[in-house]
Every structure is written in structure tokens, then in C-alpha cells.
């Protein structure tokens, strides 16, 4: 039986009965939030062999091993992942081993096993036999291996039953539990699976099979399953479905969407039966099962029941993610927020058309409206009193509407109104009139020349750069000395710079009035000598990286007591010089014969220039005869220091660790202080953990159904 579209077992362990007849779970399997410790021994699901998406276990009290629950789980396909992971075991307080002794393949995605205070038998599993790449696995904060004393079957009796492989230069036995070895196929099978008797399966089998070289005897399929056979591709008039099987058109047409009862049904595209057309495509008509390419971004019509959608937070903006046409009116009222400009762009940046009016009021957090980066048409089908379809009132920090050199926006009907926007230059408004085609519609009172822009440097002279010099991590720039009408009014300069892979940045990118700014800022004092041109050395830059730089003069000058006179430069794009690349990543070597090594690696994370070649060096090493790190005579004699709490703190050092020669003299030494790079790596690691945990909580904690 195929179960799906995803099974979520929570709160009550008896819900596990839903898995009773499942051979394949088409979708994910969540087992989580069972806080009462139960006896799971009576629950066993030997039929389950494949999960097509991912397996997530979180806070299931009393569960000590997965081996009894899922003795025959062979493949987790990872067709869809949970935050890049196909197997997540998180905060399982009583889990002692994973025990999935028949798990042979995780087709896509990595594993994350974290904060499981009692979990052992992690270092005895060779994940490289199950996954293609182990570099993204995250196994942290479990019971320390030293406290586990993981013994594979037969080791105590000195009749080891399991095979050995090398992990991190340690050649050791591989097993899942004290009585279950990790299955390995003979090297003659190559990439193929094998039977329990070590006979090679058919190339189309994945994980295991019940008979050798037979594409109808596979436990799971490497590519696709169709009518009892594993096939490399779906036959004519059938379509790939959920990444693992072939279905016909009728089957695809009759699938009900799990997400919504009123959805338009599944579509067939590029030989696949899928819930929605992929990115860049749209249905060829509302009842169609086929997709056609979109011209530009695909339209997604969003409608507001109450006609007017108020955007007063990131959360309210989130509802508009992906929308290209908004049927209704937008009222933007963002008084505060964190990183608001980029968040709003993320959620509202695809909107192209608003059918009603747009009103921006009291949005003191906004510096620019460029977050509506694709808005091209305001229809004005509904207007505010006074026939306004674009209304901008009392936005204390609004400085830019859009970058009109790269923006076409049409206001089909209705007028514009601007008042009490003290940092918005009136010339910016008049430019909008011309671009939007509303010139002549506004009355004098609609654009208040007194209270718009009265606190901005709307009269701006241009600062010109005079020289630029670069090295691998520095840029030196100088510019003409600016001379305002009254020289005493020039206070200083501010240099703004940031990485800019493309020459398309604007002054207001990522900027809001609450402190978020994608630009780095440096203040530059006036040179004391009036003949010296001002300049700055920007250091600590990345090699072979393009930066955008501009300069603003900070002045006091007022024009007729109501407008500040200022000066700024154009945006300059400048690239630092190339440098030595960082080390190549994920170096792996394997021997495929007695005289050959195959070495693989990934490019460096920081090429610092255009890579032209790699240098590979090798040398012969003496054989390491020390193959056992621990020699346990008895499992009972393992010294247990303390119960692991599942946190990821660094162990406290209670005495000076004895180390070798330090500072030229023998004797006890303190561990060397961490380098900046190590500290940064630790910081990033901690951040990454937080992000994952937030993702996990946000994904699994849902309101109770009404």
C-alpha cells in the first residue's frame, strides 16, 4: 500500500497504527511531540521499505531505537527535503541507537542528528555507504563517543561479524547496534545493491532486492517504478510522479490536491505529473493540465477580501509573496521594523499591478519605495476621496520613490497626493509625474512644495572622483574637494561602499530608517590643507571582488532657510585585485586498483580570481598499524563520567592539559587562544544551529484545528 501525501504522527503514539499497511510513504514521515514515555515494543512496521521525501523525529519520549519500528526501511529518497535534510533526528531524549539496519540509501539530501542526549552508535555507521556526499551531514550534540563504548556484534567475543571501512582515517567495524551490522555489498557489485546473500541486484534496483539481477525483485527503484518493474525512464504515455513512479494521464487528472480542495488539479509538464506548473510556466487555460512558458514573471493574482490590504509589518507583507497582480488597494503603514526594506522586497517585490490605489502613510521606517521593484501599473479602478490613486502622506524618512532611470510605472486613472514627507525632494515627485503619465492631473495642492523635502539636501552638486588605486584587499580613492557657497559649512564626507557583483545598485538598496543598510559607511574628515584632495583607504576588502562606492558631503548650508544644499558622487564600480585562492574543498581520495588513486575535490569557496589550474601533490606514507583507538575488554567497564545533556557546549577543562613542548620549554601549557577564523566559524555554526531550530519549530508547531 502507498501511503501519503505525508504522514504526521504527533501527541499520541497510537497514531502510529496509521503506518500499519504502508510499504511506501509517498511524502514525508513526521513522528514528533509525544511527551509521555510509552512502550513501543508492540509497534512494528516491517512492510515499510521506502519514504519518498524525508523522515523527521523530534521529541518522542521513550523511543529507544528505530530498528524495531522500521526493520525494513531501506530507502529515503529525499525527493523533498526538510531544510536540506532527508533524515532529521532532533532532541530525541531516550533514543539510544538509530538501528535502521536495513537503511541502504538516502538518495538526496543530508542527515541531521542533533541534541540527542543518549544517542550512541553514530561513529559506527559509515554514512558514505548510504549517502552520496557526507560533507553536509550534521551530527552534533549527541552522547560523546567516549561515553558510548559502541561495540559491534562479535567484538567482545573476538569473533567480529561486521565489515570494516575507513572514516576519518579510522579503519573500524561498521554496525547499527550491538547486534546488527551495517550491510555492505561486495565490491564486484560496484554501485549496485545486493541481496542478503551478497548477490548483486539488477542495476535498476536501489537499496536491496529479493533476487539477483531481476528488475521485478527490487525493494526500491533507482529511477522509476512502473507496473511491478524498475525502469530507467517512464514508458510512453506515462509520467513521472513524486520522483519515484510512473502514472498515466487519468491517474494524474484525478489526484486531489492535499493543499486545497478548490485547487485546479495536477498538471503534466516535461514528462512529469505535478501539483503546479514549475517556476516560469503557467497553465494553458484554467482547466488545462498542461503548462506554457510565462512571458516574464508568471502571473499570480492575489485578492483581498476587504478590498484594502494593510501592510504594517513583515508578517502582513508575507501574505503577498509571489503575487504579481494585486486586486484591491494597498495601504502601507510601516512605522518600525528590522531589515524592513529587504524583507518587504522579498514578499512584495514581484507585484506588477495594483488594480486599486496605493496609499503610503506614517511609514517612518521607509527610506525608499524600491521594495516594490516590479510595480509597473496602478490601475486606479478604486480611488481615495479626492480621486487619488497614489497617496503619500507623513513619511518622515522617505527619500526616494523609485530609481526613475530604470523604472516605468503607469498610473492609469486617478491623481497623486504628496504631503509632509520632509526628506522627499519635490523634484523626485515631479519626475514621477512625468514617468507615470499623471502630469497635469494633479492640482497645486496635491504636491506640497513647502512640506515635502524641507529637511533634505534637494539641491545636490556632483562630487567627482579624481583617482582610484586597488590592491587585493584595499581600495584608495580620492575626490575633488567640494566647495559650498560658504566654505565653513562643509563638515566632512561620508564614503559608502559595498560588494556589488552587478552594476545595478542604487543608493537606497536595502536601506531603511531603522538602521538597516546594505552599505558600509566611513566618515572622512576634511584634510587640514585646503589644497589636498580628500580621500580614503578602504581596507579589509575581499580579493577579486567588485565594490560599489559613492561619497556624500556633509554640509550645514541652507538654501533660503528651508532646504539643505549638499553634494554627492555618482556610484563608482571598482574591483579589487586577484589573490591566492583558498584551499580546495571536500578532498576525497579512493583507490580503484593497486596502482591508482582517484582524487576528487570541489573548487575553493574563495577563488579570489579566475582559477586557471590546480596543483596536485602526493607522497607515499608508511602504513598505520594502530587501528584500534580503544581496547575495551568489557562493555561494563566503560568509565561513564557524566550523562550527556544533549547541549553542544565545549567541555570544561578542569586542569591544565599536559601538552608537548610549548614556547621552547617542556611543561604544562594552556591551549592556544582561538584564532579569529575559528571564532568566526564558531559564531557562524551557532547561527546556523539557531536558524535550523527556528525552521524546525516554525514548520512543526501549528495551531490546533478548530
Amino acid at each position: 500500500e502507498i501511503c501519503g501525501p505525508g504522514i504526521d504522527i504527533r501527541n499520541d503514539y497510537q497514531q502510529l497504527k496509521r503506518l500499519e499497511n504502508c510499504t511506501v510513504i509517498e511524502g514525508y514521515l513526521h513522528i514528533l511531540l509525544i511527551s509521555k514515555a510509552e512502550d513501543y515494543r508492540s509497534y512494528r512496521f516491517p512492510k515499510l521499505t521506502v519514504i519518498t521525501e524525508y523522515l523527521l523525529l523530534f521529541r518522542v519520549a521513550g523511543l529507544e531505537s528505530l530498528g524495531d519500528l522500521f526493520p525494513n526501511l531501506t530507502v529515503i529518497r529525499g525527493w523533498k527535503l526538510f531544510y536540506n535534510y532527508a533524515l532529521v533526528i532532533f532532541e530525541m531524549t531516550n533514543l539510544k541507537d538509530i538501528g535502521l539496519y536495513n537503511l541502504r540509501n538516502i538518495t538526496r539530501g543530508a542527515i541531521r542528528i542533533e541534541k540527542n542526549a543518549d544517542l550512541c552508535y553514530l561513529s559506527t555507521v559509515d554514512w558514505s555507504l548510504i549517502l552520496d556526499a557526507v560533507s553536509n551531514n550534521y551530527i552534533v550534540g549527541n552522547k560523546p563517543p567516549k561515553e558510548c563504548g559502541d561495540l559491534c556484534p562479535g567484538t567482545m567475543e573476538e569473533k567480529p561479524m561486521c565489515e570494516k571501512t575507513t572514516i576519518n582515517n579510522e579503519y573500524n567495524y561498521r554496525c547499527w547496534t550491538t547486534n546488527r551490522c551495517q550491510k555492505m555489498c561486495p565490491s564486484t557489485c560496484g554501485k549496485r545493491a545486493c541481496t542478503e546473500n551478497n548477490e548483486c541486484c539488477h542495476p535498476e534496483c536501489l537499496g536491496s532486492c529479493s533476487a539477483p539481477d531481476n528488475d521485478t525483485a527490487c525493494v526500491a527503484c533507482r529511477h522509476y517504478y512502473y507496473a511491478g518493474v524498475c525502469v530507467p525512464a517512464c514508458p510512453p504515455n506515462t509520467y513521472r510522479f513524486e520522483g519515484w513512479r510512473c502514472v498515466d494521464r487519468d491517474f494524474c487528472a484525478n489526484i486531489l490536491s492535499a493543499e486545497s480542495s478548490d485547487s485546479e488539479g495536477f498538471v503534466i509538464h516535461d514528462g512529469e505529473c505535478m501539483q503546479e506548473c514549475p517556476s516560469g510556466f503557467i497553465r494553458n487555460g484554467s482547466q488545462s493540465m498542461y503548462c506554457i512558458p510565462c512571458e516574464g514573471p508568471c502571473p499570480k493574482v492575489c485578492e483581498e477580501e476587504k478590498k484594502t490590504k494593510t501592510i504594517d509589518s513583515v508578517t502582513s507583507a508575507q501574505m503577498l509573496q509571489g503575487c504579481t497582480i494585486f486586486k484591491g488597494n494597498l495601504l502601507i503603514n510601516i512605522r518600525r521594523g528590522n531589515n524592513i526594506a529587504s524583507e518587504l522586497e522579498n514578499f512584495m517585490g514581484l507585484i506588477e499591478v495594483v488594480t486599486g490605489y496605493v496609499k503610503i502613510r506614517h511609514s517612518h521606517a521607509l527610506v525608499s519605495l524600491s521594495f516594490l521593484k516590479n510595480l509597473r501599473l496602478i490601475l486606479g479602478e478604486e480611488q481615495l476621496e479626492g480621486n487619488y490613486s497614489f497617496y503619500v502622506l507623513d513619511n518622515q524618512n522617505l527619500q526616494q520613490l523609485w530609481d526613475w532611470d530604470h523604472r516605468n510605472l503607469t498610473i492609469k486613472a486617478g491623481k497623486m497626493y504628496f504631503a509632509f514627507n520632509p526628506k522627499l525632494c519635490v523634484s523626485e515627485i515631479y519626475r514621477m509625474e512625468e514617468v507615470t503619465g499623471t502630469k497635469g492631473r494633479q492640482s497645486k495642492g496635491d504636491i506640497n512644495t513647502r512640506n515635502n523635502g524641507e529637511r533634505a539636501s534637494c539641491e545636490s552638486d556632483v562630487l567627482h572622483f579624481t583617482s582610484t588605486t586597488t590592491s587585493k584587499n584595499r581600495i584608495i580613492i580620492t575626490w575633488h574637494r567640494y566647495r559650498p557657497p560658504d566654505y565653513r559649512d562643509l563638515i566632512s564626507f561620508t564614503v559608502y561602499y559595498k560588494e556589488a557583483p552587478f552594476k545595478n545598485v542604487t543608493e537606497y538598496d536595502g536601506q531603511d530608517a531603522c538602521g538597516s543598510n546594505s552599505w558600509n559607511m566611513v566618515d572622512v574628515d576634511l584634510p587640514p590643507n585646503k589644497d589636498v584632495e580628500p580621500g580614503i583607504l578602504l581596507h579589509g576588502l575581499k580579493p577579486w571582488t567588485q565594490y560599489a562606492v559613492y561619497v556624500k558631503a556633509v554640509t550645514l548650508t541652507m538654501v533660503e532657510n528651508d532646504h539643505i544644499r549638499g553634494a554627492k558622487s555618482e556610484i563608482l564600480y571598482i574591483r579589487t585585485n586577484a589573490s591566492v585562492p583558498s584551499i580546495p574543498l571536500d578532498v576525497l581520495s579512493a583507490s580503484n586498483s593497486s596502482s591508482q588513486l582517484i582524487v576528487k575535490w570541489n573548487p575553493p569557496s574563495l577563488p579570489n580570481g579566475n582559477l586557471s589550474y590546480y596543483i596536485v601533490r602526493w607522497q607515499r606514507q608508511p602504513q598505520d598499524g594502530y587501528l584500534y583507538r580503544h581496547n575495551y575488554c568489557s562493555k561494563d567497564k566503560i568509565p561513564i563520567r557524566k550523562y550527556a545533556d544533549g547541549t553542544i557546549d565545549i567541555e570544561e577543562v578542569t586542569e591544565n592539559p599536559k601538552t608537548e613542548v610549548c614556547g621552547g620549554e617542556k611543561g604544562p601549557c594552556c591551549a592556544c587562544p582561538k584564532t579569529e577564523a575559528e571564532k568566526q566559524a564558531e559564531k557562524e555554526e551557532a547561527e546556523y544551529r539557531k536558524v535550523f531550530e527556528n525552521f524546525l519549530h516554525n514548520s512543526i508547531f501549528v495551531p490546533r484545528p478548530e
Epitope: E433, G445, D562
Partner: antibody, heavy 117, light 112 residues
Framework: QVQLQQWGPGLVKPSGTLSLTCAVS?????????WSWVRQPPGKGLEWIGE???????NYNPSLESRVTISVDKSKNQFSLKLSSVTAADTAVYYC??????????WGQGTTVTVSS | DVVMTQSPLSLPVTPGEPASISCRSS???????????LDWYLQKPGQSPQLLIY???NRASGVPDRFSGSGSGTDFTLKISRVEAEDVGVYYC?????????FGGGTKVEIK
């Protein structure tokens, strides 16, 4: 105190182009005001010709739009009027003025332009 | 275009007496912000016009308080509480609500 000083030829031939310039002193043309041109035919009332903002944005009287060009020169702190294809009907006193949000509060001294061959 | 109509065409006055000029627009000059976009100007003989009243009822700087403006929408009035000899000239109303800006035909105030 802002003052407007205007100048230009007093006599223009029919079908020729009338050119007048207005210089702003005591303030900046880049302040947030519109700079207007108004004319008054002999013995008649005032007629608004058009206006310019320092950014270059303009508004013209539709009755004259096809013939009129108003421009600004920020470096010289002045703005200009050009009226092409003039006829005797364009004979008038031409005034430049500062149009604040609160009315036209500063006016030039006026230039009498006669269109005659 | 907004048409502005002034009356009377000519207004003979006695110094020390009050005077009143009316101005009517072909459409409302009241903006949704609450202001009436109507200005009053005086052009003394041989001089450039000068601003008296802006936004319907606000006296421009340096204008004596004997001048006052009132009205809303389409009907406006300029009052001089006690006319002085220096007040002679042509008074113009102008709508500043939308372009093209338009002037009334003018009212000539002269001493009797």
C-alpha cells in the same frame, strides 16, 4: 531678500522668436519654488504663460504650449522664456515671478516686448 | 481651464470707506487638504503686480491688515476695511489650484 531681474530685446519681428531671461539674486533657483512667466497685453489683464521647477519640470498654458519653451540654468541662477512664431498679438509686458506654494510673492520689473516689423 | 470672473469691473471708492471685490470660479478651488487655492494681487499703476492674499484668506508678508480675504469653493471676496489713497490700482484674483493658472479680468479701484 530674493529679487528678480529680467531682460531681453524690446522689439521682435513677426514670426521671430521672443527670448527673455530672468536672473534670481539673493537666493537659489534650486529652492523649492516654481519660476513663472506672466504677460499683460496693453490695457488688458494678466495671462499666465508657464512655469519651471529647478529639476527641469515644466507646465505650460495649453494656448501657448506649441510655441513656448521655459528653461533653467542652475549654474547661472537664472531661467529663460522663448516664444516662437510671434505675432502682434504677443505684444505685451512680460513678467517673471517666483511662485511659492503661497502665491507669486516676488515679481520681476517687467519687460515690454513689441512685435513689429 | 478654470474660468475666473471678477466684479465689479470698476470700483470708485472714498478714502476711509470700506470696499469689497467679488471673484467667482467656474469650479471649486477647495482642495481636500482644506485650503482654497485662490490668491489676490494688486497692480499699482506702472508697477509689477504684488501678492496680497494667498490660499483664500492668508495675508502675504508686509500687507496691511486692512486687507482681508474670505470665501470658499467658488465664491471669494477681497475686503479693504478703510481704503487709502495708495490702494488704487487693478486688483486681480487668480486660481492656483491647477494649471493653467488663470486670472480674473481685474477690478479697477480708483478714488472718487
Amino acid at each position: 531678500q530674493v529679487q528678480l531681474q529680467q531682460w531681453g530685446p524690446g522689439l521682435v519681428k513677426p514670426s521671430g522668436t521672443l527670448s527673455l531671461t530672468c536672473a534670481v539674486s539673493g537666493g537659489s533657483i534650486s529652492s523649492s519654488n516654481w519660476w513663472s512667466w506672466v504677460r499683460q497685453p496693453p490695457g488688458k489683464g494678466l495671462e499666465w504663460i508657464g512655469e519651471i521647477y529647478h529639476s527641469g519640470s515644466t507646465n505650460y498654458n495649453p494656448s501657448l504650449e506649441s510655441r513656448v519653451t521655459i528653461s533653467v540654468d542652475k549654474s547661472k541662477n537664472q531661467f529663460s522664456l522663448k516664444l516662437s512664431s510671434v505675432t502682434a498679438a504677443d505684444t505685451a509686458v512680460y513678467y517673471c515671478a517666483r511662485d511659492r506654494y503661497y502665491g507669486m510673492d516676488v515679481w520681476g520689473q517687467g519687460t515690454t516686448v513689441t512685435v513689429s516689423s | 481651464d478654470v474660468v475666473m470672473t471678477q466684479s465689479p469691473l470698476s470700483l470708485p471708492v472714498t478714502p476711509g470707506e470700506p470696499a469689497s471685490i467679488s471673484c467667482r470660479s467656474s469650479q471649486s478651488l477647495l482642495h481636500s487638504n482644506g485650503y482654497n487655492y485662490l490668491d489676490w494681487y494688486l497692480q499699482k499703476p506702472g508697477q509689477s503686480p504684488q501678492l496680497l492674499i494667498y490660499l483664500g484668506s492668508n495675508r502675504a508678508s508686509g500687507v496691511p491688515d486692512r486687507f482681508s480675504g474670505s470665501g470658499s469653493g467658488t465664491d471669494f471676496t477681497l475686503k479693504i476695511s478703510r481704503v487709502e489713497a495708495e490702494d488704487v490700482g487693478v486688483y486681480y484674483c487668480m486660481q492656483a489650484l491647477q494649471t493653467p493658472l488663470t486670472f480674473g479680468g481685474g477690478t479697477k479701484v480708483e478714488i472718487k
